[in-house]
């Protein structure tokens, strides 16, 4: 962090969670679309 107070550990964890959440949403949307098209 620019302020030097914090490690980057927690923000890294949260970024990883955000990516997983985004991918889950995208994959979920694709799956729903596939089911809809059948």
């Amino acid at each position: 962090h620019s302020d030097g107070i914090f490690t980057d550990s927690y923000s890294r964890y949260r970024k990883q969670m955000a990516v997983k959440k985004y991918l889950a949403a995208v994959l979920g949307k694709r799956y729903k679309q596939r089911v809809k098209n059948k």
Epitope: S2, F6, Y10, Y13, R14, M17
Partner: antibody, heavy 108, light 112 residues
């Protein structure tokens, strides 16, 4: 954050202001409570950047987190309070920097 | 929901001795995101160790952490009177599947 005595069924908002640094997108404000003589209990966290929040399952919509990045502040809204919610409430940034805590007592 | 079990709940140590505190997680914590905190009466918790084994800034080297997955350990070597406190572990989990965080029940360290 201002705590104090609240009647059962009442509401209270606790707020925490970061000083000495500015909240950024790298910061999450988390809230933890500790009943008298008991252990630490995670309540939830809110992103200073996006405002996205997540909560412990047990919270069950009783509590709500908010933040104002311009004011460098995060708040915890406590609703439908019962004596079981009597505790010291701590705010923490990324679990690294902790506030001194505020005691909330729920009693008639 | 996830559970972090800390053992023992209380431990006594002589000055200069060694204390070992265990933290067992179910399920596994996410990618070794396990932290340790020290709390003294009337004070907020103090950040000691993050990512299982990394020492926070200003924490004495007599504190060390180890472990991965479901089993973690905090060790205090050369215990000092000032180490008398309650210690907590905190796990970070895959938020999509469970709560993001859980604390262990705490371990009280008494220094003789």
């Amino acid at each position: 954050a201002e705590g104090g005595l609240v009647k059962p069924g009442g509401s209270l908002e606790l707020c925490c202001k970061a000083s000495g640094f500015s909240l950024t997108t790298s910061h999450w404000m988390c809230w933890v409570r500790q009943a008298p003589g008991k252990g630490l209990n995670w309540i939830g966290c809110i992103s200073a950047g996006s405002g996205d929040a997540d909560y412990a399952t047990w919270v069950d919509a009783q509590f709500t987190l908010s933040r104002d990045i311009d004011q460098n502040t995060g708040c915890l809204q406590l609703n439908s309070l019962t004596p079981a919610d009597t505790a010291m409430y701590y705010c923490t940034i990324n679990f690294e920097l902790w506030g001194q805590g505020t005691l909330v007592t729920v009693s008639s | 929901a996830q559970v972090l079990t800390q053992t023992p709940s209380s431990v006594s140590a002589a000055v200069g001795g060694t204390v070992t505190i265990n933290c067992q997680s179910s399920p596994s914590v996410y990618s070794s995101y396990l932290s340790w905190f020290q709390q003294k009466p009337g004070q907020p918790p103090k950040f000691l160790i993050y990512e299982a084994s990394k020492l926070a800034s200003g924490v004495p080297s007599r504190f060390s952490g180890s472990g991965s997955g479901t089993q973690f350990t905090l060790t205090i070597s050369g215990v000092q009177c000032s180490d008398a406190a309650t210690y907590y572990c905190l796990g970070a989990y895959d938020c999509g599947r469970t709560d993001c965080h859980a604390f262990g029940g705490g371990t009280e360290v008494v220094v003789k």
